[in-house]
């Protein structure tokens, strides 16, 4: 008669994929069809894989996702011409562990962080065999890095300065497939190297050839002498200049620039050690020519008393305002209405209070420090009758 061999009475498995094995001997050797596995709920499973040696048949079953409710008595069954044999065995399905809390950041420097991994309490089953601390920079397309940890307090080294990182903990229990899902994520930012940049930086055009950079007063925390280093470079040309400004000043005039050119400026506070650069600021010097006409002009949503006009403007011409001028078709030039939009970032305006059933001539032009653009063509606008929906 067949005989089931090497099957322990009790098996502990981790939830997830599970491949139980039934091994049997006997003559003739049991075939694929003659070996089954019966779950506690009575479901009969057939081998997904099968092989045999001279003395044994080995049936491999596949359960894609075994869960705690599947715990209980399973039965390996072999039924051949020589007879039938069954062997019950107990399976205990465990829940993979996952920390309930995110790790805590105790301390950070410019290249390290001290972390309390907060691995307990956790959801799921123990005992915990090992713990991993996973980390990666935010906004980087890098894979998670990890370190194995034994203590609750761990130091992460070799981090980048002034970089935001994400942290989480992964717990591993004994047995195959014992890696739990990573727990909640904590974000933190490493410190800067050197002094922080000046606060309240502001860059504004002063003239066609100058830009003015201002910042809040700097109060050093040590006795060391310090100065502000300002770097300016042209976006259009490969032209860069670094200027040293005494630490007691709160502004610098960047001169000898070119009209209608965009510059990028940044600043830092240096002592013996160099400080950390500020974010880039950009500004255009004032224009030396009239601005071009607004482009992409579109009049839409026309009703009996209103219409929406939209447009775009080109960067770099120091455009300070947009004027929409409209008048009834055929009326004198001086009988027009001017709408001045002083915020040049606005690109849409609703003309209101128009007369129904009236033809208007609409012009739109841009103004800068030199003057106004010259519209080549007027736009026609005919309001609808009050009864007519747009």
């Amino acid at each position: 008669t067949p005989k089931i061999v090497d099957l322990p009475d009790h098996i502990e498995v981790n939830s997830g994929k599970f491949n139980p094995i039934c091994k049997a001997s006997g003559w003739p050797l049991p075939t694929n069809e003659e070996m089954t596995l019966v779950k506690p709920d009575g479901t009969v499973l057939h081998p997904k894989d099968f092989n045999h040696t001279d003395h044994f048949s080995v049936a491999i079953f596949t359960i894609h996702r075994i869960l705690p409710p599947d715990s209980g008595v399973w039965v390996c069954s072999v039924n051949t011409v020589a007879g039938m044999v069954e062997k019950p065995f107990n399976i205990s399905v465990k829940v993979l562990p996952k920390p309930l809390n995110a790790p805590n950041v105790i301390d950070t420097g410019h290249n390290f962080a001290v972390i309390n991994i907060s691995s307990e309490p956790y959801f799921g089953d123990g005992p915990i065999k090992s713990k991993k601390l996973l980390y990666k920079p935010v906004n980087h397309y890098e894979a998670w890095q990890h370190i194995q940890v034994t203590n609750e307090i761990v130091t992460l080294n070799y981090l980048e300065p002034r970089t935001e990182y994400e942290l989480c903990v992964q717990l591993v229990r004994r047995g195959e497939g014992g890696e739990g899902h990573p727990g909640p994520v904590r974000r933190f930012t490493t410190a800067s190297i050197g002094l922080p940049p000046p606060r309240g930086l502001n860059l504004l055009p002063k003239s066609q050839t100058t830009l003015n950079l201002t910042w809040q007063p700097i109060f050093p925390s040590s006795e060391d002498d310090f100065y502000v280093e300002v770097e300016r470079r042209s976006v259009q040309k490969s032209d860069q200049q670094n200027i040293k400004v005494p630490g007691n000043l709160t502004s610098v005039l960047l001169n000898n620039l070119h009209p209608r050119e965009q510059y990028v400026v940044r600043a830092r506070v240096n002592t013996k050690a160099q400080g950390e650069w500020s974010e880039d600021l950009t500004a255009w010097t004032l224009s030396d020519i009239l601005p071009p006409q607004p482009e992409n002009i579109k009049i839409s949503n026309i009703t009996h008393s209103s219409a929406v006009i939209s447009w775009t403007i080109l960067d770099g011409y120091s455009i300070s305002s947009i004027t929409i001028r409209y008048k009834v078709q055929g009326k004198n030039e001086d009988q027009h209405v001017d709408v001045k939009i002083k915020n040049a970032t606005i690109t849409q305006y609703q003309l209101k209070g128009l007369e129904p059933e009236t033809a208007y001539q609409v012009d739109i032009f841009a103004e800068n420090n030199i003057g106004s653009s010259n519209p080549a063509f007027s736009h026609e606008l005919v309001t609808l009758p009050e009864s007519q929906a747009p």
Partner: antibody, heavy 115, light 107 residues
Framework: QVQLQQPGADLVRPGASVKLSCKAS????????MNWVKQRPGQGLEWIGM????????RLNQKFKDKATLTVDKSSSTAYMQLSSPTSEDSAVYYC????????WGQGTTLTVSS | DIQMTQSPSSLSASLGERVSLTCRAS??????LNWLQQEPDGTIKRLIY???NLDSGVPKRFSGSRSGSDYSLTISSLESEDFVDYYC?????????FGGGTKLEIK
């Protein structure tokens, strides 16, 4: 001065889609709607649709929604109308016209659909 | 869609004569109406927009007017180049629609 240049004629086989062009000059192409109008031989005018080159917003006559596709190429200031699966019913003169109020018209392209 | 009924469909007149063409709108279109001229070679030109506004370069003998839902194009004194086709066009409501056209012929 404003000009809308259209090829004088085009011949297409039935079922083979055709793309008509309208090259604009003398004004800011991206600031005015462009209309397309159909005229069958000896008949009146029929509006197909319009497109605004700034953002390619398109408004189509429901009658032509499965027939006409309007596009623009801002770099060459050219408007296009593609007609799908043309039949003899699509043989006509096709005009482009500038602006929401049809202020300037192209010379028209005579499209002949014939095998 | 708004229907534009244009009359007459053809009209014979003499040089120097005063003529009027009419379009009637099936719904209220306010002043949202143009008059177009089409020459025998197919060239189309806008003569009048918004019912009564003369386009630049268009002779003063052309004028547009409105009475209720009836819109008129008047040519005060016909000249030889005026004997072509005329269409009205409404754009108050989408889709814009055209009148059936008037063929102006020399008597």
């Amino acid at each position: 001065q404003v000009q809308l240049q259209q090829p004088g004629a085009d011949l297409v086989r039935p079922g083979a889609s055709v793309k008509l062009s309208c090259k604009a000059s003398g004004y800011s192409f991206t600031s005015y709607w462009m209309n397309w109008v159909k005229q069958r031989p000896g008949q009146g005018l029929e509006w197909i649709g319009m497109i605004h080159p700034s953002d390619s917003e398109t408004r189509l006559n429901q009658k032509f929604k499965d027939k006409a596709t309007l596009t623009v190429d801002k770099s060459s200031s050219t408007a296009y109308m593609q007609l799908s699966s043309p039949t003899s019913e699509d043989s006509a003169v096709y005009y482009c016209a500038k602006g929401y109020y049809f202020g300037y018209w192209g010379q028209g392209t005579t499209l002949t659909v014939s095998s | 869609d708004i229907q534009m009924t244009q009359s007459p469909s053809s009209l014979s007149a003499s040089l120097g004569e005063r003529v009027s063409l009419t379009c009637r709108a099936s719904q209220d279109i306010g002043i949202s109406l143009n008059w177009l001229q089409q020459e025998p070679d197919g060239t189309i030109k806008r003569l009048i927009y918004a019912t009564s506004n003369l386009d630049s370069g268009v002779p003063k003998r052309f004028s547009g007017s409105r009475s209720g839902s009836d819109y008129s194009l008047t040519i005060s004194s016909l000249e030889s180049e005026d004997f072509v086709d005329y269409y009205c066009l409404q754009y108050a409501s989408s889709p814009p629609t055209f009148g059936g056209g008037t063929k102006l012929e020399i008597k």
